[in-house]
């Protein structure tokens, strides 16, 4: 497979943000790639959001993804959104060069994202 | 040395504050056993917070330690407080048998303790 | 009153084979890891064997000078501990002492390796 | 393996002298750390345990001082019964290696 590195441990932000790099070797000149993120709890994996993108172009995820991302060569700058304390996982990035032919897949050893809820604020009187 | 088991991974909570067993196999019947927590970061070893107790009784940490602890058999229950983004580290658990001879000595693998400081509560009008 | 009688030592030759023991008194002997240390002449102290108790499975630790020639053990119901010394060496020559975890010294017993 | 450097290997001083000997482990032994004193047909005997601990009937001329890699023996006033030689020695874990001594004698 090909190789695909990603950071062991991220802490989300105390707004439930949480930002990674997935790097991968590319065996060659791709065009068109396409990455996605999985979660790994209690071993059941679930996709978290996934985009395609032409080397040069900004990623693009649906509107209601929780992802949003950049890329600059081989490297995909992932950010995820809205997470809560239910949300600590391992989190794959898998990577796809969709074009030209041959078809290459790398997956990472996943990035173990931790989150913490934040205590509420006391009301304003 | 002695065998000392303490969590891989342990989440502060936004207030700051994190808890974590640490639990030792005494080799024989200790009366006095003194519980030391140290932070190693950068390979820097720092003590956090030292406790001396008599089995069956209760843990006491010095006034102004950041430290608090019960003991039940071979279990110490550790918990930090006061702690910052900043303080994110390793936390290693030291479990000396003073008395009676022989003294043993046992460290623990540490307990990575992730702290993220909280967004600020919005000012009350 | 805590005491370590070790017994067994005496004159051997090269490639031969020796045990010593080591009578404990005093103490709750099972509640203890147990130790050989020898000194050679005119040399320092060596830490040579290590035999932990029934908490920790009587786990054998040894040092590189002596391990695969000379084994541990202990009898609990007897409060004794054992170093069998086997292909003895000239320079396994000392005064050998048994001792529970550093605490408590035997008076040595004198091993000599000599043709 | 843990390496332990004891200094000096040997030292003279007079009755009443502040006396230092020094440990250098060869990496961090979180104090597991002993110190005896061993008499010429005499048994080795405990002296500091844990680095800094007195052991039972030892007198409080004796202190253990010192974490991480380095640690010092201190005889506050020596006498003349201190005469012996002395070995630190790692308790952390195997092989419990030993210093190679410290030979002390009145001037």
């Known amino acids: 497979a090909m190789h695909v590195a990603q950071p062991a441990v991220v802490l989300a932000s105390s707004r439930g943000i949480a930002s990674f790099v997935c790097e991968y070797a590319s065996p060659g000149k791709a065009t068109e790639v396409r990455v996605t993120v999985l979660r790994q709890a209690d071993s059941q994996v679930t996709e978290v959001c996934a985009a395609t993108y032409m080397m040069g172009n900004e990623l693009t995820f649906l509107d209601d993804s929780i992802c949003t991302g950049t890329s600059s060569g081989n490297q995909v700058n992932l950010t995820i959104q809205g997470l809560r304390a239910m949300d600590t996982g391992l989190y794959i990035c898998k990577v796809e060069l969709m074009y030209p032919p041959p078809y290459y897949l790398g997956i990472g050893n996943g990035t173990q994202i931790y989150v913490i809820d934040p205590e509420p604020c006391p009301d304003s009187d | 040395a002695m065998h000392v088991a303490q969590p891989a991974v342990v989440l502060a909570s936004s207030r700051g504050i994190a808890s974590f067993v640490c639990e030792y196999a005494s080799p024989g019947k200790a009366t006095e056993v003194r519980v030391t927590v140290l932070r190693q970061a950068d390979s820097q070893v720092t003590e956090v917070c030292a406790a001396t107790y008599m089995m069956g009784n209760e843990l006491t940490f010095l006034d102004d330690s950041i430290c608090t602890g019960t003991s039940s058999g071979n279990q110490v229950n550790l918990t930090i407080q006061g702690l910052r983004a900043m303080d994110t580290g390793l936390y290693i658990c030291k479990v000396e048998l003073m008395y009676p001879p022989p003294y043993y000595l046992g460290i623990g693998n540490g307990t990575q303790i992730y702290v993220i400081d909280p967004e600020p509560c919005p000012d009350s009008d | 009153e805590v005491q370590l009688v070790e017994s067994g030592g005496g004159l051997v030759q090269p490639g031969g084979s020796m045990r010593l023991s080591c009578a404990a008194s005093?103490?709750?002997?099972?509640?203890?890891?147990m130790n050989w240390v020898r000194q050679a002449p005119g040399k320092g102290l060596e830490w040579l064997a290590q035999i932990r108790n029934k908490p920790y499975n009587y786990e054998t630790y040894y040092s590189a000078s002596v391990k695969g020639r000379f084994t541990i053990s202990r009898d609990d119901s007897k409060n004794s501990v054992y170093l069998q010394m086997n292909s003895l060496k000239t320079e396994d020559t000392g005064v050998y002492y048994c001792?529970?975890?550093?605490?408590?010294w035997g008076q040595g017993t004198l091993v000599t390796v000599s043709s | 393996d843990i390496q332990m450097t004891q200094s000096p290997s040997s030292l003279s001083a007079s009755v009443g002298d502040r006396v230092t000997i020094t440990c250098r482990t060869s990496e961090n032994i979180y104090g597991g750390l002993n110190w005896y004193q061993r008499k010429p047909g005499k048994s080795p005997k405990l002296l500091i345990y844990g680095a800094t601990n007195l052991a039972s009937g030892v007198s409080s001329r004796f202190s253990g001082s010192g974490s991480g890699t380095d640690y010092t023996l201190t005889i506050s006033s020596l006498q003349p019964e201190d005469v012996a030689t002395y070995y630190c020695q790692n308790v952390l874990r195997s092989p419990f290696t030993f210093g190679s001594g410290t030979k002390l004698e009145i001037k």
């Open positions: 001792t529970a975890q550093f605490a408590y």
């Open positions: 005093g103490f709750t002997f099972s509640d203890n890891w």
